[in-house]
C-alpha cells in the first residue's frame, strides 16, 4: 500500500444515469487529472483498477464483473453497465498503478428513475435556440459509443410526454430534431430515445434536454441605458438624499458578460471618499433579454456631491455605451413668512 | 492598429459638390460604431457637422448641415460625406472621428488625419 | 444650441508652470464636458470626458472639473510638449437633438 495519488471525490462530474439502461463511463483521470491517456498508460504497463463505494456505506469494495450477461463490464478506460441498477448508485474509483505509480480519482454515480413521461431528478442540459433564426437542430446528446456504426438504431423524439409526430415547425430527422422557425412557444423538454440491439437483447437510451428560445443575434443592439436620461433632472436640496437609478437594457446575446458600473467624477464609487452605496437588480425577458438596474444612493447629499460628475456606463459583446445624469442643485424658494408677519403688524 | 484615413479632398468650384471618403483599418463598420465628420477652417476651431450610427444606420446632423451634407455608410469599412452647393465658407480640413461609444455621445477618441477642401474658383 | 465660450485665447507659461483654460457654457450642460489638444497641423486628441474622466494614455498633469455651465482644464507641471490649442466641447447625446458645441480654441504657448 505505497503512496497513491489520489485526487479526491470529483463531484464536478457529478454522472446521472437512467435505471434499466446501458451506461458507458470513461475513467476521468484521463480526461481531466493526467497528461496521458489510457493507450500510453497502458503500452507503459499501468493497470487500470476499478471498485466503488455503496450508497450510505463507507467500505470500498471491488466491482464484480462477473455478473451474469456481463451486466457490469470494463473496457480499456470505460466502465460500462448494460444496463444499470438503483442500486449501482454510488462513489466509484478508478485508479491507475504499476509498482511505483499510482494515481486515482473518484467519481459520484447516480442511477434514477424516470416515469412514463421522462420526469426524473435527473439534471437537464439546456440548448438554446434563437427565436424566428430560421432551420435549427438539437442532436440527441451523449449516445457515441454505445454501439457500432454498422448499427442503425430507431430515435423516437418526444415533446414533454407526447411523441414529436405532424408538429407545425418541429421535424425530427434521426438524431437530429429540426425547428424551422423557433417560437417562444417552442420552450420545454424535448427527449430522444435511441433504441438499439446488442448480442440479441434490445436496449433503450433515454436523453432529455431543455430547449429554450432566446433573443437573436440578428435583433441584437448594443446596452440601452434607459436611466440617467434626458429627462430627468436629480434636483436635490444638500441634506437629502439623492437615488440616481442606472437602468440598462441588455439584448440576449451568446456568452456575452453584461456589465454596468457607474463612475463618480471619472472613478469607481469604491474609489472616492463619499458615502456612497449601489444596489443591482435583475430581470429577464422570456427570451432571456436582461434588465440591469443599479441604484446609486447617498444617504445626506452635500452641495459639492450635488457638482460631480455621475455617469451610468454598460457594456457587452455589441460595445460599450454611458450616460451621464442630470444633478443639480434645487434652489430654496424665498421665504416670505417675516415679511408677511411685518406687513400685518398692529399701528 | 485601428485607424481611419479620409480622402476626397481637393479644390472645388463654388456651387459644386464633393464627397469624402472615410476608411477604417483595424476595425469594422460590421459592429456597433458611430463615426462622424468634424472640420476645421484655415486657422479656425473645429466644427461638427454629421453622424451616423454604423449598426443602426441612424444619421445625426448639425442643424447647418441639414440639407447639403449626407452621410453614409457605403461598405462594411468606408463612410462618407456628400457635400453639395458648395461655398468658399466650406473651404477646411475635414476630419472623421469615431465615437468613444458604441451608440452617439459625441466623445471622440479616434481621429483620422484629415482631407482638405478648398472651394475656390 | 449651445455656445461653448473658452477663455483665454490664448496662454503662455514655462516649463513646469500650470496652465488653466476655461469654458463657459450658453446653458446648464451638466457633465457633458469634453477637452482635445489639438497640435499645429495634426489630428485632434480627446484628453477628458465627462467633465473630469481622463482618456487612458493621457497623463495626470491633465486634469477637468466644473459642472453645470462653467468648466477648467489645468495643465500642471507644463511640459514643452503640450504646446498646442484646447477645445473644449459640449457632447451631448439627446435622441430629439444632437448639437456638439466646440469652444473656440485656446493656445498654450510655452516658454
Known amino acids: 500500500s505505497e503512496r497513491c495519488d489520489d485526487w479526491g471525490l470529483d463531484t464536478m462530474r457529478q454522472i446521472q444515469v437512467f435505471e434499466d439502461e446501458p451506461a458507458r463511463i470513461k475513467c476521468p483521470l484521463f480526461e481531466h487529472f493526467l497528461k496521458f491517456n489510457y493507450s500510453t498508460a497502458h503500452s507503459a504497463g499501468l493497470t487500470l483498477i476499478w471498485y466503488w463505494t455503496r450508497q450510505d456505506r463507507d467500505l470500498e469494495e471491488p466491482i464484480n464483473f462477473r455478473l451474469p450477461e456481463n451486466r457490469i463490464s470494463k473496457e480499456k478506460d470505460v466502465l460500462w453497465f448494460r444496463p444499470t441498477l438503483l442500486n449501482d448508485t454510488g462513489n466509484y474509483t478508478c485508479m491507475l498503478r504499476n509498482t511505483t505509480y499510482c494515481s486515482k480519482v473518484a467519481f459520484p454515480l447516480e442511477v434514477v428513475q424516470k416515469d412514463s413521461c421522462f420526469n426524473s431528478p435527473m439534471k437537464l442540459p439546456v440548448h438554446k435556440l434563437y427565436i424566428e433564426y430560421g432551420i435549427q437542430r438539437i442532436t440527441c446528446p451523449n449516445v457515441d459509443g454505445y454501439f457500432p456504426s454498422s448499427v442503425k438504431p430507431t430515435i423516437t423524439w418526444y415533446m414533454g410526454c407526447y411523441k414529436i409526430q405532424n408538429f407545425n415547425n418541429v421535424i425530427p430527422e434521426g438524431m437530429n430534431l429540426s425547428f424551422l422557425i423557433a417560437l417562444i412557444s417552442n420552450n420545454g423538454n424535448y427527449t430522444c430515445v435511441v433504441t438499439y440491439p446488442e448480442n440479441g437483447r434490445t436496449f433503450h437510451l433515454t436523453r432529455t434536454l431543455t430547449v429554450k428560445v432566446v433573443g437573436s443575434p440578428k435583433n441584437a443592439v448594443p446596452p440601452v441605458i434607459h436611466s440617467p436620461n434626458d429627462h430627468v433632472v436629480y434636483e436635490k436640496e444638500p441634506g437629502e438624499e439623492l437615488l440616481i437609478p442606472c437602468t440598462v437594457y441588455f439584448s440576449f446575446l451568446m456568452d456575452s458578460r453584461n456589465e454596468v458600473w457607474w463612475t463618480i467624477d471619472g472613478k469607481k464609487p469604491d474609489d472616492i471618499t463619499i458615502d456612497v452605496t449601489i444596489n443591482e437588480s435583475i430581470s429577464h425577458s422570456r427570451t432571456e433579454d436582461e434588465t440591469r438596474t443599479q441604484i446609486l444612493s447617498i444617504k445626506k447629499v452635500t452641495s459639492e456631491d450635488l457638482k460631480r460628475s455621475y455617469v451610468c456606463h454598460a457594456r457587452s459583446a455589441k460595445g460599450e455605451v454611458a450616460k451621464a445624469a442630470k444633478v443639480k442643485q434645487k434652489v430654496p424658494a424665498p421665504r416670505y413668512t417675516v415679511e408677511l408677519a411685518c406687513g400685518f403688524g398692529a399701528t | 492598429q485601428e485607424q481611419l484615413v479620409e480622402s476626397g479632398g481637393g479644390l472645388v468650384q463654388p456651387e459644386g459638390s464633393l464627397t469624402l471618403t472615410c476608411q477604417a483599418s483595424g476595425f469594422t463598420f460590421s459592429s456597433y460604431y458611430v463615426i462622424c465628420w468634424v472640420r476645421q477652417a484655415p486657422g479656425k476651431g473645429l466644427e461638427w457637422i454629421a453622424c451616423?450610427?454604423?449598426?443602426?444606420?441612424?444619421t445625426y446632423y448639425a442643424s447647418w448641415a441639414k440639407g447639403r451634407f449626407t452621410i453614409s455608410k457605403t461598405s462594411s469599412t468606408t463612410v462618407t460625406l456628400q457635400m453639395t452647393s458648395l461655398t468658399a465658407a466650406d473651404t477646411a480640413t475635414y476630419f472623421c472621428?469615431?465615437?468613444?461609444?458604441?451608440?452617439?455621445?459625441?466623445?471622440?477618441?479616434?481621429w483620422g488625419p484629415g482631407t482638405l477642401v478648398t472651394v475656390s474658383s | 444650441d449651445v455656445v461653448m465660450t473658452q477663455t483665454p485665447a490664448s496662454v503662455e507659461a514655462a516649463v513646469g508652470g500650470t496652465v488653466t483654460i476655461k469654458c463657459q457654457a450658453s446653458q446648464n450642460i451638466y457633465s457633458n464636458c469634453a477637452w482635445y489638444q489639438q497640435k499645429l497641423g495634426q489630428r485632434p486628441k480627446l484628453l477628458i470626458y465627462?467633465?473630469?474622466t481622463l482618456e487612458s494614455g493621457v497623463p495626470s498633469r491633465f486634469e477637468g472639473s466644473g459642472y453645470g455651465t462653467e468648466f477648467t482644464l489645468t495643465i500642471s507641471d507644463l511640459q514643452s510638449a503640450d504646446a498646442a490649442t484646447y477645445y473644449c466641447?459640449?457632447?451631448?447625446?439627446?435622441?430629439?437633438?444632437?448639437?456638439?458645441?466646440f469652444g473656440g480654441g485656446t493656445e498654450v504657448v510655452v516658454k
Open positions: 466641447q459640449y457632447t451631448y447625446d439627446s435622441s430629439s437633438s444632437t448639437s456638439w458645441a
Open positions: 472621428a469615431r465615437d468613444r461609444y458604441a451608440t452617439v455621445s459625441g466623445i471622440l477618441n479616434l
Open positions: 465627462y467633465v473630469s
Open positions: 451616423i450610427g454604423t449598426g443602426d444606420g441612424l
